[in-house]
């Protein structure tokens, strides 16, 4: 059975700012003609054939909903892209991760301004503080770094908060195992 | 490479007013920051106050606080300077300067020559 | 009134290593990076060192710069002829919310 293909995103933030860059592209399986990729926002069909979507310049109105297809097979889950404008945004590598497996947050200025002073919130309460920026990583998510995360910092000596980010950590799936 | 070129030297009664320009060229004026820095004759470096053309702001040194303004005219690149109420000591060389796009240590990266602002009556 | 406080002067022979303190407080240099300028006589300052220890391109390696809690210090190691200038500390201030420069060391080579 061909497997759906997996729309994945560099850099691979899905909160990104207008004005900046991500490509998108349609990963799966013994795809032969790299050239015959359907893209899909908001349900609508894109111009786009190619296996990789660029994303230039990005506007507020490319935001939504992005799913790919190759061939006749079914179509990619769907990838979920938001355009802000903001001083400040908090980036996740997922906004839903299962259990065991990474999770990197980013804050991240505008127009690529150093952040600096920069406390991560999960829940209210502060996590992390470096005066130069740095990424916060978990290389292994657990049901307890599900919460509210948060970041503030100064971009030119000026205080900014970001937009609050929902983060929702799922346990894996359990294997279930059949006796013959 | 960015270059700041001031206007020309002024003469000022006490009372008045001067408006010194700081044109940029050779980069993106856009994407720093102008602050505004005086020296009086035999003096140290003193800071007055800085703009962010692209985000509109700017903010003072409380000792200047009332008596000056800075604005910036993105369309031609240039900053500018007013201060008001002038008094003797206020006889300095003003200069412009960039500071580094990257604001976190706030350096002063490129200057302007200076212009000379002498008070007399 | 300046609130980071230097040495009015400095001096020392060709070749020398010549110090330059830089005295602030927890607002200023304590939570903030140090920068350090040049002025050569008659001529604009000129920045020498940023982010505490960081020469800008074109900045000859024997100025270096350190930071340690409130203070900060510019090395001059084998001096010339063409240092002899006067060299400014600076660094954000929290509480005044704006920038602030040291007193000024005037560096003579004898």
């Known amino acids: 059975v061909p497997q759906k293909p997996k729309v994945s995103l560099n850099p691979p933030w899905n909160r990104i700012f207008k004005g900046e860059n991500v490509t998108l592209t349609c990963n799966g399986n013994n795809f032969f003609e790299v050239s015959s990729t359907k893209w899909f926002h908001n349900g609508s069909l894109s111009e786009e054939t190619n296996s990789s979507l660029n994303i230039v310049n990005a506007k507020f109105e490319d935001s939504g909903e992005y799913k790919c297809q190759h061939q006749q097979v079914n179509e990619s889950e769907p990838v979920y892209l938001e355009v802000f404008s903001d001083w400040l945004l908090l980036q996740a590598s997922a906004e839903v991760v299962m259990e065991g497996q990474p999770l990197f947050l980013r804050c991240h200025g505008w127009r690529n301004w150093d952040v600096y002073k920069v406390i991560y919130y999960k829940d209210g309460e502060a996590l992390k503080y470096w005066y130069e920026n740095h990424n916060i990583s978990i290389t292994n998510a657990t049901v307890e770094d599900s919460g509210t995360y948060y970041c503030t910092g100064k971009v030119w000596q000026l205080d900014y908060e970001s937009e609050p980010l929902n983060i929702t950590v799922i346990k894996a799936p359990r294997e279930k195992y059949w006796l013959q | 490479e960015v270059q700041l070129v001031e206007s020309g030297a002024e003469v000022k009664k006490p009372g008045s007013s001067v408006k010194v320009s700081c044109k940029a060229s050779g980069g993106t004026f856009s994407s720093y920051a102008i602050s505004w820095v005086r020296q009086a004759p035999g003096q140290g470096l003193e800071w007055m106050g800085r703009i962010i053309p692209i985000l509109g702001i700017a903010n003072y040194a409380q000792k200047f606080q009332g008596r000056v303004t800075i604005t910036a005219d993105k369309s031609t690149s240039t900053a500018y300077m007013e201060l008001s109420s002038l008094r003797s000591e206020d006889t300095a060389v003003y200069y412009c300067?960039?500071?580094?796009?990257?604001?976190?240590?706030?350096?002063?990266?490129?200057w302007g020559q200076g212009t000379t602002v002498t008070v007399s009556s | 009134q300046s609130v980071l406080t230097q040495p009015p002067s400095a001096s020392g022979t060709p070749g020398q290593r010549v110090t330059i303190s830089c005295s602030g407080s927890t607002s200023n240099i304590g939570g903030n990076s140090v920068n350090w300028y040049q002025q050569l006589p008659g001529a604009a300052p000129k920045l020498l060192i940023y982010?505490?220890?960081q020469r800008p391109s074109g900045v000859p390696d024997r100025f270096s710069g350190s930071k340690s809690g409130t203070s900060a210090s510019l090395a001059i190691s084998g001096l010339q002829s063409e240092d002899e200038a006067d060299y400014y500390c600076a660094s954000w201030d929290d509480s005044r919310n704006g920038y602030v420069f040291g007193t000024g060391t005037k560096v003579t080579v004898l």
């Open positions: 982010a505490n220890i």
């Open positions: 300067a960039r500071v580094n796009p990257f604001g976190y240590y706030y350096a002063m990266d490129v």
